[in-house]
């Protein structure tokens, strides 16, 4: 599972008086010579880039996705990759690069013009010309040419949750991403079984907010698993 | 002008807790990894703990862990560090900063102070036996 994969994660040798070790969502950190990594006693020196192990996009780097290292990997196991530049494959935006967007499977420019007329156009063609709304958000968005100077406000159209203001993230609604509002305590959030099953909503909901997680609510433990109700709850 | 004020500080007896509080002004910090670093007397700054921009990814020193929690509210621009069983070697002057969200991640990444571009001017923890 991902969880073991980074317990056993450990950073043996940061120049002193810092060290680190890969955790999720928690790590211990400790000052001592070399990098030991699981499957194998071999250690390596703090120059070679570190795999970041993420549970998604936003936990990497701008330049990052995150993702199973190998093809048709084991799906719990996801680390931060380098992003796909232009003309190369990709499956959803944040594959692709700052500056691009992934259109038909291809990292594509996203220059301002052209990104707001095929989000738009996207959109459009997938609802018809029905502008009615469905959970408070509106089905046809178009990406404001402000949204590289400021950040997205609630329902903007957004790559990364960068892109959006404090207290939203982005999350896929429909076939497009938006800005949302992140999870306050007692709303209801989504506890994915599996790493990378996120991957399947098309209403993707938020992260719970500061000092919540996502648990399952006390008078649903005797619900079945699959009806099991989870909200957001002070840690 | 980018400021991080800290706060909490105090002095407290072996086994008790503090809350540490960073404030952030002049500018968001939503993208930026938060952390806190400490110093004691005559010896060199170390790293304490840090918190990711997505909220949802900390890192700790061996000697902290499951002693230190460290969050974050993006809304209020501020980061927080709850230390409890608190101990003798835990007195330091203890800083607060922000590293900018990187293009490529790792943990290294956390706990190197050179990726710090904003710092407080420290708050101080005294913890006696």
């Known amino acids: 599972t991902l969880n073991s994969v980074l317990n056993s994660n450990a950073i043996k040798n940061l120049p002193p008086p810092l060290g680190g070790a890969a955790g999720h969502p928690g790590s211990a950190v400790s000052a001592a010579p070399g990098i030991l990594y699981p499957g194998g006693n071999k250690y390596q020196t703090i120059d070679n880039y570190q795999p970041y192990p993420c549970a998604e996009d936003e936990e990497c780097g701008t330049d990052e996705y995150c993702a199973s290292p190998t093809r048709g990997g084991d799906a719990g196991v996801q680390i931060c990759l380098a992003c796909r530049k232009r003309r190369k494959r990709c499956m959803r935006h944040a594959m692709c690069c700052p500056g691009n967007y992934c259109k038909n499977g291809i990292c594509v420019s996203s220059d301002q013009n052209h990104f707001r007329g095929e989000i738009e156009e996207t959109i459009t063609e997938s609802f018809g010309n029905d502008h009615s709304t469905l959970d408070g958000y509106s089905r046809r968005t178009t990406l404001s040419s402000k949204m590289y100077h400021t950040k997205g406000q609630e329902g903007s159209v957004c790559l990364r949750s960068s892109d959006c203001a404090s207290g939203l993230c982005c999350a896929r609604h429909f076939w497009s991403k938006i800005c949302k509002p992140v999870l306050k305590e007692g709303q209801v959030c989504t506890k994915h079984r599996r790493k990378g099953s996120h991957g399947l909503e098309i209403f993707q909901r938020c992260y719970c907010g500061e000092g919540l997680s996502c648990r399952i609510q006390k008078d649903h433990h005797q619900a079945s698993n699959s009806s099991r109700l989870h909200t957001c709850q002070r840690h | 002008e980018v400021q991080l004020v800290e706060s909490g500080g105090g002095s407290v007896q072996a086994g008790g807790s503090l809350r540490l509080s960073c404030t952030a002004s002049?500018?968001?910090?939503?993208?930026?990894?938060m952390a806190w670093f400490r110093q004691a007397p005559g010896k060199e700054r170390e790293f304490v703990a840090a918190i990711s921009w997505s909220l949802s990814r900390t890192h700790y020193a061996n000697s902290v862990e499951g002693r230190f929690t460290i969050s974050r509210d993006n809304a209020k621009n501020t980061a927080f560090m709850q230390m409890s069983s608190l101990k003798p070697e835990d007195t330091a002057v203890y800083y607060c900063?922000?590293?900018?969200?990187?293009?490529?991640?790792?943990?290294?990444?956390?706990?190197?102070?050179?990726?710090?571009?904003?710092w407080g001017q420290g708050t101080q923890v005294t913890v006696s036996s």
């Open positions: 900063a922000a590293a900018p969200r990187p293009k490529r991640v790792s943990v290294q990444y956390f706990v190197t102070s050179s990726n710090y571009d904003y």
């Open positions: 002049g500018r968001p910090f939503d993208n930026y990894a």
